[in-house]
């Protein structure tokens, strides 16, 4: 009498997440009488996958009718595969008894599940930084299998090199995640810049998946301040101008002080954008020279994006000869003017 063989013809089967997997198994003989069961894994910790006689296995169906007389095909189909289904599946023949006794196992079929990475999500720094400072961007993608994946960073199309990338877990797993950090040195011209995280994987039929972040969310470009006086008007009024240039973001408050006292406060809004994404703003203050006996110290105070105020001061000289006013002026800078 020929010894019973349990034949699992495929050493391995690959399937995409969401698809069905067919695991083939045939036996060489109908004798001895007894059931076939499918397990994932071997040894005492193995997991029962399918048993015709008992149990509820909603995702597993036999390929051929196991109740048919002389059936020797015990192949199964597992539907809606997920990465968690990966593993080695064994078709095992039992001899009928009380209890049934394990007789012979197939060689096993390794099921590998291929799953696409999720769309990369790029996150930037929590607080803005100024030019010449380094900021970090993080890119994450999850749920892919197999583990092999490539991730590249680009800034305005140029690949970044200051990058640290980890794929977890390090050992064998049903699916994997990737996390990468790129360090970017900011420049004043980066308001319109973009960083791209590009993920490539065997399952992707298109181009690599991309996640983006705009450096406008990470950068602060502090303003330049300049205070100038226009020539004296006939009515003894002096027009003093505070030019605030090349700043980003737009959130800016300007306060005029006359001899230390608040004269006027303005908030920037709906400003036109410069080509480089920064903003300019000009504020004017009319000073009636004849109303003052002494020199007038005017200060243009700018508070940008919640940062400490920057001042630029200007002295309007009051003289006994008003007609000479136009040239008798001086400007002074107080505080620090961030650049």
């Amino acid at each position: 009498e020929e010894e019973l063989q349990v034949i699992q013809p495929e050493k391995s089967v690959s399937v995409a997440a969401g698809d069905s997997a067919t695991l083939n198994c045939t036996v060489s003989s109908l004798i001895p009488v007894g059931p076939i069961q499918w397990f994932r894994g071997a040894g005492p910790g193995r997991e029962l996958i399918y048993n015709l006689k008992e149990g509820h296995f909603p995702r597993v169906t036999p390929v051929s009718d196991p109740t048919k007389r002389n059936n020797m095909d015990f192949s199964i189909r597992i539907s809606n595969i997920t990465p968690a289904d990966a593993g080695t599946y064994y078709c095992v023949k039992f001899r009928k008894g009380s209890p049934d006794v394990e007789l012979k196992s197939g060689a096993g079929t390794e099921l590998s599940v291929r799953a696409k990475p999720s769309a990369p999500v790029v996150s930037g720094p929590a607080v803005r930084a100024t030019a010449e400072h380094t900021v970090s961007f993080t890119c994450e993608s999850h749920g892919f299998s197999p583990r092999d994946i490539t991730l590249k960073w680009f800034k305005n199309g140029n690949e970044l090199s200051d990058v640290q990338t980890n794929v977890d877990p390090a050992g064998k797993s049903v699916s994997y995640s990737i996390r990468s950090t790129a360090r970017v040195v900011l420049t004043r011209r980066d308001v319109h810049s973009q960083v791209i995280c590009e993920v490539a994987h065997v399952t992707l039929q298109g181009d690599p998946l991309r996640g983006t972040a705009n450096l406008s969310e990470a950068i602060r470009v502090p303003p330049f301040l300049e205070v100038t006086q226009q020539s004296m008007r006939a009515d003894n009024q002096v027009n003093v101008t505070c030019q605030v240039t090349k700043f980003y973001p737009q959130r800016l408050q300007l306060t005029w002080l006359e001899n230390g006292n608040v004269s006027r406060t303005e908030m920037a809004s709906a400003l036109p954008e410069n080509k480089d994404g920064t903003y300019n703003w000009t504020s004017w203050l009319l000073v009636n020279v004849s109303a003052h006996r002494d020199d007038v110290k005017l200060t243009c105070q700018v508070e940008h994006d919640g940062q400490p105020a920057v001042n630029k001061s200007f002295s309007v000289k009051v003289s006994a000869h008003p007609k000479e006013q136009g040239s008798n002026t001086a400007a002074e800078n107080t505080g620090t003017n961030e650049r």
Epitope: A16, R114, D148, V202, T203, L204, Q205
Partner: antibody, heavy 116, light 109 residues
């Protein structure tokens, strides 16, 4: 599901030649497609692929000698300036449904002979 | 580019016998290796992908194995219809490029 090449003929060196791969039973917008060639009595050689979104990628030796493009139903391989060394049977193929690491549907090939 | 070295270039075996073809990659290709069969004047036919996964409809007499840089195709119970040239093909996940081995001609006596 099938693919078939056309456009193979006798050509002269330096005269551009375009081969076409026509697919049926699946959409080019869902799969990566590749071009390969096989000189008489030689082995298979990879030329390049085009992604489902239409981006071409080439073998390092190509150096502008070929251009891959596609429409909704066909993929083209343009031989920009053929030489006699480009005489070969050209195959187009589709990658497998599980990933881009293998090709499971191949065309029968089309013969290009470049001769003076 | 990765170089694929396939050996032997030719092998002869009898019907019912076994043939082993080896393919070595210039660097690790992480099991991204496929095997094709090509008969004269015909298109290549996929046999195995991901080093050991049998393509649907291919007889289980064809077995693929290996990892890292070294891979093997074993054809057992040889049939006369197995006479063909066999090619290995790699995919490198970092460069995203493909390479073929030089081919092995299998002659069945």
């Amino acid at each position: 599901q099938s693919v078939e090449e056309s456009g193979g003929r006798l050509g002269t060196p330096g005269t551009p030649l375009t081969l076409t791969c026509t697919v049926s039973g699946f959409s080019l917008s869902s799969y990566v497609m590749g071009w390969f060639r096989q000189a008489p009595g030689k082995g298979l050689e990879y030329i390049g692929i085009i992604s489902s979104s239409g981006s071409p990628y080439y073998a390092s030796w190509v150096n502008g000698r070929f251009t891959i493009s596609k429409t909704s139903t066909t993929m083209d391989l343009k031989m920009n300036s053929p030489t006699t060394e480009d005489t070969a049977t050209y195959f187009c193929a589709r990658v497998g449904p599980l990933g881009v690491d293998y090709f499971n549907i191949w065309g029968p090939g089309t013969l290009v002979t470049v001769s003076l | 580019d990765i170089v694929m070295t396939q050996t032997p270039s030719s092998v002869e075996a009898a019907v019912g016998g076994t043939v082993t073809i080896k393919c070595q990659a210039g660097q690790s290709i992480n099991s991204y290796l496929a095997w094709y069969q090509q008969k004269p004047g015909q298109r290549p036919k996929l046999l195995i992908y991901y080093a050991s996964t049998l393509e649907s409809g291919v007889p289980s007499r064809f077995k693929g194995s290996g990892s890292g840089t070294d891979y093997t195709l074993t054809i057992s119970d040889l049939e006369s219809a197995d006479a063909a040239t066999y090619y290995c093909q790699s995919w490198h996940y970092i460069s995203r490029s493909y390479a073929f081995g030089g081919g092995t001609e299998v002659v069945v006596k």
